[in-house]
Structure formats: structure tokens, C-alpha cells
């Protein structure tokens, strides 16, 4: 028998520095977690103790903090190289800055193979990107070899900016021939490493003949055997065992997100490459694990540029940006409109001639807007200003909801109106009218939404049975501020870009902004 240790991360989302327990900015260092310096310590400890170790990443290193905003992926290559990652799969967020923003900082600089079997380049891009990412790679480990095949969510064109010269194929269809090729090369230990979410990971384990282990990402799935060490609630045991269609037991793993855990899976193979046993658990990277001093010093060196960036002007406002709780928790506020407009703008994807865009709607809890921005400071808007407005380090995500769920959400928005509570919704691509004289749960008297399948966008009444795409904060997608109906009834959820980054990019693009209060939210006469 031959034993392999798989160390794995996924959805790190630019958390190069240690974070608080909820993966936001580290405040009290003695209670902070994760970060590449701490990850390095644990990886080094395991590599020194065990003979056959692979360190893998299942995608979405890009996007999530000011590190990515400033360094645009160069930081990913630099620190992953320093940790000596063995392979990485492409995630959807790796395309956030377009294909060039993937090629130059990451694909050309990474010392490790970057993989995806279901992304096919065409046209002029095919020769430019040739060899920079691969469908699979065979890695020597000790005296054996292990094949790694990559895959990426086929929804990436809707979630990011891969352009028109990359085709995202069905994962299972694309993986099978590559695994077959590895088998003909006498590679009998094969790991599928990818970024399509836990449901697809399980399908790959079930359907792709020859895959021995699946290491996934995208859905931020936390698996654990035994008592979990932090706040995350396990979605199942680690590893999650899937019985394949050909009768094999295939371990499937994921390691939550944000570099908070290091996945740790031990696999025992027989001489024919069959999995005999698998066991392990994610390792919580808490403060009991010291940060490596040399990596930490490197982080501090790179950090200097971030501090300079946060005070630079992104753009100007010529109007007061009203982000006060007195406004945003009671009525339409122009800060809410600005943020929602930025959220929609960030999700412009012209992928189909039938649709002007795939999504037109935004909702945003008023309680998530934490500060106004005064235009009387020469109109200057900085990252620092935006960090005061959006201090929680969240993301603006894409969900699919039925009209009936949206109606419930808007009823919840005003079910206890007047108490300055955070659930009052700011909107984009939506016109809502409330009648507060009616009883809670029946206060939405008009709800019109902007069409997407149209050449001239216009507002139509919401249809209860129709499925709509909506951009919203991850906080709401996870049921925050009492929006349990969104969490319980959403049909799809894909995590998006860092909130501050979305707004800062929009302001930089527009250069001068002047958002107005324009009648998106109204109260019917006599009730307000």
C-alpha cells in the first residue's frame, strides 16, 4: 500500500493576511485565523513529517480584499509559489479581470500547473494561452506519480468575465476523455481538482470513471467528522463518500473558504491504484499555529502599497451620498441606489442576443450601509471612505429566486417598519410601493421589475412563478436580517465580488457620480 496526503484549500478569496473568525479584517490578533504565513507553518510541519504530500488549490484565489484590488493576482502567484503549491484549478473568479488579468499575473508567473479540462480556447486566444493552463498534469510524488485533472464551473460566463474566446463545456463530458488518457499513460491514481460546487463534485465522483478522489470548491462547503472546531456547521462528513456508478467508494472533499482551514486528507492506495482507505479532517488555522516569520515579513513588505492605495482618489461625487441609517433604513437613499447600480454594472454580461443582460435586479439591506460620504471634501471618494460605508468585507452574490420569494422578501422589508431596523431594502431594477396602513405581511401593493429578455428595458409586474436572477449581499443570501425565505427558497447561489471592490470599480469607471433619489421605493398616499 502507498499513502498520499492531500492538503487542500479553496475559495481563499484574497485572504493573504490573517482574518477574524468570520473571515473579515483581523482586529484582535490573538484571536485571528488563517493567512498565508500561518498556512505555511502548517504545510511545512506536515511536509516535514510525512513523505508523500500534495498541496492543491481548487480555485477562486482571486477577488475578496484590497490585496486583489491593488495587486490584481500578482500576490496570488507570489505567495502560492512561496508555499510551493503543487497544482491549482481555475475558479470562476480567476476571470474577474478578463483573460489578460489571468494570463499575465498568474498563468505566466505560477511555478505550479494551473488546470481546467472543460475550458477550451478558440480563435486568436487559442495560441496566446496555449500551455499556460492544462487539462491535466501528472505530478511525481515520492516514488509514484499522481494525475490531477482540473475543472471549472460552466456558469463562469455568467459569473465573471472570461470573454468570448473561451468555451466552458460540461464538466463530466470534458473530464472523462482526459482521465482515460491518463489511464493509457499508466497513471492509476487520479485526483479531480475543481471549482464547480459540491453537487457537481459528487456527480463527478459518481460519473467519471477512473477518478479516485475529488477535491472541490465554489460552494464553500464545510465537511467535518466529529465535533467541529469553530462556527461552521458541517454539510456532511469529511471525506464525503460517494459510491460511483462502477461501484467504487470515492472520497469528496472541500475546505470551507477564506483560508480558514487547511483540508487534510490521507488516502491509502493499493498497488493497482485503488483507494483502500481515506480519512482526515480540515485543520482550523487558529492562533495556536504561529505565523511563519519569513512569510509574515514578506506580507508586511507587500502590505505597504495597500496602505498607500486606500487613501488615493477613486473618483468624485458632486452630491451628498446619504448613507445615514435615518435615511437608508426608512426610505430610498441615494447611497443605496449608487451601490445597487454598481452591483448591476458589475454583472453586465452580454451572453445572449435575446437578453440585454442576464440580471437586472438588486436588493440590499439598508442596515448594511454604515456611513454617508460628504461631497464637501472636494468630492473625493477613497477606498477608505468606501470601507466605512461597507465595513463587513462581504460579497455581492448572484442568486436565482422565484417571484413569490421576492414578494416575501419585500414584505419582510417593512414588516416592522419605523423601528430603524436593518432589513429595509434598497433596490435597483425594481419599483416597489408599500402601503403601511395594511397589516404586516400584506404591505407590498406594487412590485414591478426590470425585464431582461428585452431590447428596451422596461418595468413589468413581478410574476410569482417566474424565476428571477437577483444580485444581493452574501449576508442576505445566507438569510441575514431575518431574510430566511431567501436562504430557504433560493434555487441557485453563486458568490460574487468583494462589495467595496464592486463600488470602487464603478466609481473609477464613472469618474464623477451624482446618484439621486428617483422613486424606486414609494409609499402609497395616506400611509406615510
Amino acid at each position: 500500500a502507498w499513502e498520499l496526503t492531500i492538503l487542500h484549500t479553496n475559495d481563499v478569496h484574497s485572504r493573504l493576511e490573517q482574518t477574524s473568525e468570520d473571515s473579515s479584517k483581523c482586529v484582535n490578533a490573538s484571536r485571528c485565523m488563517g493567512g498565508v504565513a500561518r498556512l505555511f507553518t502548517k504545510v511545512q510541519q506536515i511536509r516535514r513529517a510525512e513523505p508523500n504530500v500534495l498541496l492543491l488549490d481548487a480555485g477562486d484565489q482571486y477577488q475578496g480584499t484590497i490585496w486583489f484590488t491593488v495587486y490584481k493576482g500578482a500576490e496570488v502567484a507570489h505567495f502560492m509559489n512561496a508555499l510551493r503549491y503543487d497544482a491549482m484549478a481555475l475558479g470562476n473568479h480567476e476571470f474577474d479581470n478578463g483573460v489578460e488579468g489571468l494570463i499575465e499575473p498568474l498563468l505566466k508567473e505560477a511555478k505550479f500547473p494551473i488546470l481546467s479540462a472543460n475550458i477550451k480556447a478558440k480563435g486568436p486566444l487559442a495560441s496566446q494561452i496555449s500551455g499556460l493552463y492544462l487539462p491535466y498534469k501528472v505530478l511525481p510524488v515520492g516514488d509514484e506519480v499522481v494525475g490531477i485533472v482540473g475543472y471549472t464551473s460552466k456558469e463562469t460566463p455568467f459569473l465573471s468575465n472570461p470573454g468570448t474566446n473561451l468555451v466552458f463545456e460540461d464538466e463530466i463530458t470534458a473530464l472523462q476523455p482526459e482521465v482515460d488518457k491518463l489511464k493509457t499513460l499508466n497513471v492509476n491514481k487520479i485526483i479531480a481538482l475543481g471549482h464547480s460546487g459540491f453537487e457537481m463534485d459528487k456527480l463527478i465522483a459518481q460519473k467519471v470513471r477512473g477518478v479516485d478522489v475529488v477535491v472541490g470548491g465554489h460552494s464553500n462547503t464545510f465537511l467535518y467528522t466529529g465535533n467541529p472546531p469553530s462556527k461552521e456547521v458541517p454539510a456532511g462528513k469529511y471525506p464525503f463518500i460517494v459510491t460511483s456508478d462502477d461501484g467504487r467508494k470515492v472520497p469528496v472533499v472541500q475546505a470551507y473558504a477564506f483560508g480558514k482551514y487547511l483540508g487534510y486528507l490521507k488516502i491509502e492506495f493499493d498497488e493497482r491504484g485503488n483507494v483502500i482507505s481515506s480519512h482526515g479532517n480540515p485543520i482550523l488555522l487558529n492562533s495556536s499555529i504561529p505565523e511563519d516569520p519569513s512569510i509574515k515579513a514578506d506580507i508586511n513588505k507587500w502590505r505597504i502599497k495597500l496602505d498607500n492605495y486606500s487613501t488615493q482618489e477613486l473618483g468624485k461625487t458632486i452630491v451628498y451620498l446619504d448613507g445615514s441609517s435615518q435615511s437608508c433604513r426608512f426610505r430610498e437613499c441615494n447611497m443605496g441606489n449608487l451601490i445597487c447600480d454598481a452591483m448591476i454594472n458589475n454583472n453586465l454580461r452580454h451572453t445572449d442576443e435575446m437578453f440585454w443582460n442576464h440580471v437586472s435586479m438588486c436588493i440590499l439591506n439598508g442596515g448594511g450601509i454604515r456611513s454617508p460620504i460628504d461631497e464637501r471634501n472636494n468630492g473625493t471618494i477613497t477606498w477608505e471612505n468606501l470601507a466605512a460605508v461597507l465595513p463587513f468585507g462581504g460579497t455581492f452574490d448572484l442568486v436565482q429566486l422565484k417571484g413569490s420569494t421576492l414578494k416575501k422578501a419585500f414584505e419582510h422589508s417593512v414588516h416592522r417598519y419605523g423601528q430603524s431596523t436593518g432589513e429595509f431594502l434598497q433596490v435597483g431594477g425594481i419599483h416597489v410601493v408599500y402601503d403601511l396602513s395594511r397589516k404586516p405581511g400584506d404591505r407590498v401593493v406594487k412590485l414591478d421589475v426590470l425585464c431582461t429578455k428585452c431590447r428596451v428595458p422596461s418595468y413589468d409586474p413581478l410574476k410569482m412563478d417566474e424565476v428571477y436572477k437577483v444580485i444581493l449581499p452574501n449576508f442576505l443570501a445566507n438569510g441575514g436580517d431575518g431574510f430566511q425565505m431567501i436562504k430557504d427558497e433560493l434555487l441557485r447561489h453563486d458568490s460574487g465580488d468583494q462589495d467595496i471592490n464592486v463600488v470602487s470599480t464603478y466609481i473609477s469607471k464613472m469618474k464623477v457620480i451624482y446618484p439621486a433619489v428617483e422613486g424606486r421605493i414609494k409609499f402609497s398616499t395616506g400611509s406615510h
Epitope: 510551493r84 505566466k108 511555478k111 491535466y136 501528472v138 511525481p140 497513471v187 519569513s294
Partner: antibody
Framework: QVQLVQSGAEVKKSGSSVKVSCKAS????????ISWVRQAPGQGLEWMGR????????NYAQKFQGRVTITADESTSIAYMELSSLRSEDTAMYYC??????????????WGQGTMVTVSS | QAVLTQPSSVSGAPGQRVTISCTGT?????????IHWYQQLPGTAPKLLMY???RRPSGVPDRFSGSKSGTSASLTITGLQVEDEADYYC???????????FGGGTKLTVL
């Protein structure tokens, strides 16, 4: 950018051992792999083995297994290659080499100046 | 006997184009292990010329290019110059040998 500076030439008796050093300066020594490659007079290059100092992991070419030992001292940024049971065929230029800043772990961007080891009977 | 096979010598006149082949097997190039190329001028240490089949380190002129097909790789030099006269080596991993291997080397003579 890292530079590799090797110890001086050695003349050794057949059956003895030689230990060649390779000092890294001007970069992060420990995160790179250090390989040892030799070249007999008028012959081609031959990979002997490597070490990743941060992990202490080593790989050796089958031909040299049991006869070569590669070690590294992170505190001094020095890698060592010791070859035992020397014979005349071991007379060669011995190079240490590293990936450095190039985007591949196993490509040798940075080379030491070489250490000539002569084995006399 | 080297695991990767290279012609022992090639030659060309200044300005011409020459190609050096590196033939392997399914246990090295055929498996997709990277090929790197080195140039060794007389009396000096080797210099990395091309890595991962087609990529040039900074400072290497674009007259040098690499390619791969099946179990073979090749290095092409266009617009040959006198200073290109040197020995050239390919390198890969070999799963049978369980280690990194070099080709036997090719002596390029500029006529």
C-alpha cells in the same frame, strides 16, 4: 535575485567522500529547490538529486541512491552534497542549481559556478 | 545512454534557422512532463534558455522558440548568430527513472 556560490575544487582519493557546499545569497533560499547536477569532462549533464530546504524533502537519482546525501542549513542558506565511495568515473564538475524566480519549480534558472572534483586512484 | 535523445551535432550558417530535437517516451515527454532547454557556452555553467516547452526567461532573445509534439520536443533558433555556438540540452522528469533527466546534448556549430 538569488546567487549560488560553491566551494572550491577538490582532489580526492578513490573510496573516500567529498562534500561540496553551495551558498545562496540575495534571496529567499529556503523556498527554492536546490538540485545538484554533474558533468564529467567532455560529457553531458547528469541530475543527481535535490532538496527543498523549507520542507527538508529530498529526491535522488536512482543511479546515486545510497551514495549521495543532500542536506541544507536554512540558518546559513547553505546546501551540501556529499558523495561517498568515490571512483575515477566521479571526476566531474559538480553544479548546484535552483529554480529562482522562473515560473517552474524544476527548471534551473540559477547555477553555481561549479566545483571541480577530481578522483585519483 | 541518455533517456532523452538529441542529435549529437547540428550546424548552420549565420542568419539560418536550425532545429534541435529531443525525443523521449511515454514515461517523460509523452506524459506531459515539462521540457526545459539549456545553453552551455564553452567553459561556463549552463544557462536556462526555455522552460515549460515554450516560455523564455527574461533576457533570452525571441530568436529562440520551443515546441512539443507527442513524445518529442524541439528547440528552434532563427537568425542564427555566431554567439549561439554552444551545447544545448533538454531536460524533463522521467517516471521510470523517478527523477529529472537530461538529453545527451547537441553541439551547435555556426559555420
Amino acid at each position: 535575485q538569488v546567487q549560488l556560490v560553491q566551494s572550491g575544487a577538490e582532489v580526492k582519493k578513490s573510496g573516500s567522500s567529498v562534500k561540496v557546499s553551495c551558498k545562496a545569497s540575495g534571496g529567499t533560499f529556503s523556498s527554492y529547490a536546490i538540485s545538484w547536477v554533474r558533468q564529467a569532462p567532455g560529457q553531458g549533464l547528469e541530475w543527481m538529486g535535490r532538496i527543498i530546504p523549507i520542507f527538508g524533502t529530498t529526491n535522488y537519482a536512482q543511479k546515486f541512491q545510497g551514495r549521495v546525501t543532500i542536506t541544507a542549513d536554512e540558518s546559513t542558506s547553505i546546501a551540501y552534497m556529499e558523495l561517498s565511495s568515490l571512483r575515477s568515473e566521479d571526476t566531474a564538475m559538480y553544479y548546484c542549481a535552483s529554480d529562482g524566480a522562473v515560473a517552474a519549480y524544476d527548471a534551473f534558472l540559477i547555477w553555481g559556478q561549479g566545483t571541480m572534483v577530481t578522483v585519483s586512484s | 545512454q541518455a533517456v532523452l535523445t538529441q542529435p549529437s551535432s547540428v550546424s548552420g550558417a549565420p542568419g539560418q534557422r536550425v532545429t534541435i530535437s529531443c525525443t523521449g517516451t511515454s514515461s517523460n515527454i509523452g506524459t506531459g512532463y515539462d521540457i526545459h532547454w539549456y545553453q552551455q557556452l564553452p567553459g561556463t555553467a549552463p544557462k536556462l534558455l526555455m522552460y515549460r516547452f515554450t516560455r523564455r526567461p527574461s533576457g533570452v532573445p525571441d530568436r529562440f522558440s520551443g515546441s512539443k509534439s507527442g513524445t518529442s520536443a524541439s528547440l528552434t533558433i532563427t537568425g542564427l548568430q555566431v554567439e549561439d555556438e554552444a551545447d544545448y540540452y533538454c531536460q524533463s522528469y522521467d517516471s521510470g527513472q523517478r527523477g529529472w533527466v537530461f538529453g545527451g546534448g547537441t553541439k551547435l556549430t555556426v559555420l
